[in-house]
Amino acid sequence: MMTGTIETTGNISAKKGGSVILQCHLSSTMAQVTQVNWEQHDHSLLAIRNAELGWHIYPAFKDRVAPGPGLGLTLQSLTMNDTGEYFCTYHTYPDGTYRGRIFLEVLESSVAEHSARFQIP
């Protein structure tokens, strides 16, 4: 039975040209996280963090995606095209798959704030 829940940074905004941290956190389960996949609104795979093998940033995003902090992902040099949904998929044993959603809005405005529901140090 899947008892866990995914908390995410929810709806966030960030300034064009800046960077943003995407974070998901799996709680309320003792399941082992074997892999976390990060993907974009169009199903593009951004990155994978495998428990045994470490991080992989997919070739198309190597220039502006950085692993971490933690199991999160940092997007850099943001463009307006980065606006949209992002998904974290936690592959766990024995529970199975948990999926979280984040909506990022990239703003032209210089007063764009990056606000998060929670922060993981």
Epitope: T34, Q35, N37, E39, H43, S44, L45, I48, N50, E52, L53, G54, H56, Y58, P59, A60, H91
Partner: antibody
Framework: EVQLVQSGAEVKKPGASVKVSCKAS????????IEWVRQAPGQRLEWMGV????????NYKEKFKGRVTITADKSSSTAYMELSSLRSEDTAVYYC??????????WGQGTTVTVSS | DIVMTQSPDSLAVSLGERATINCKAS??????VAWYQHKPGQSPKLLIY???YRYTGVPDRFSGSGSGTDFTLTISSLQAEDVAVYYC?????????FGGGTKVEIK
């Protein structure tokens, strides 16, 4: 030029073990994964497991856990796959491949392992 | 494990004609699919990764598309040297799994 050169064909008896080597050249050995894939006669390709030569981290397909061991020697840029308790259904061509993480951009020439009494 | 189902099992196409191979994943794999060409007596060769990215040096007659669970490899104009078995593979999660292969022949 990237190359993966595997050891030669092996004939083993049921219950024995086999160790296949894969010598990498032409790239930074610790910057890519080494994956092991096999193909039994008339069957699809089957992924067995992977090693990160930089960290030594490994990941195995569940059905092979306890029977397969993948190792890497950084000093010689060589990866090894050892399969124990061999049975006839392990007769296959075994390939090592360089992993651009989880897809495989260069492959060894293959090593035929025959298990027969 | 994620099951990759390829269709058709075999395909006969005239030289210069289009060949289309399909691959269906048993669950969501995002764009985590690669395609390989395997000729008899040779090692497999990577053609496409991440569903639609052509690998370095692969002729542009090979293209890939799809996301989620449904994927396609297209050879736009079949050449004699394209006779081979083609495999899809999901690289979304371990264990990585391959389709059963599609044998492409000249009609």
């Amino acid at each position: 030029e990237v190359q993966l050169v595997q050891s030669g064909a092996e004939v083993k008896k049921p219950g024995a073990s086999v160790k296949v080597s894969c010598k990498a050249s032409g790239y930074a050995f610790t910057n890519y994964l080494i994956e092991w894939v096999r193909q039994a006669p008339g069957q699809r390709l089957e992924w067995m497991g992977v090693i990160n030569p930089g960290s030594g981290g490994t990941n195995y397909k569940e059905k092979f856990k306890g029977r397969v061991t993948i190792t890497a020697d950084k000093s010689s840029s060589t990866a090894y796959m050892e399969l124990s308790s061999l049975r006839s259904e392990d007769t296959a061509v075994y390939y090592c491949a360089r992993g651009e993480y989880f897809f495989f951009d260069y492959w060894g020439q293959g090593t035929t392992v025959t298990v027969s009494s | 494990d994620i099951v990759m189902t390829q269709s058709p099992d075999s395909l006969a196409v005239s030289l210069g004609e289009r060949a289309t191979i399909n691959c269906k994943a048993s669950q969501h794999v995002s764009q985590g699919v690669a395609w390989y060409q395997h000729k008899p007596g040779q090692s497999p060769k990577l053609l496409i990764y991440s569903a639609s990215y052509r690998y370095t040096g692969v002729p542009d007659r090979f293209s890939g598309s799809g996301s989620g669970t449904d994927f396609t490899l297209t050879i736009s104009s079949l050449q004699a040297e394209d006779v081979a078995v083609y495999y899809c593979q999901q690289h979304y999660n371990t264990p990585h799994t391959f389709g059963g292969g599609t044998k492409v022949e000249i009609k």
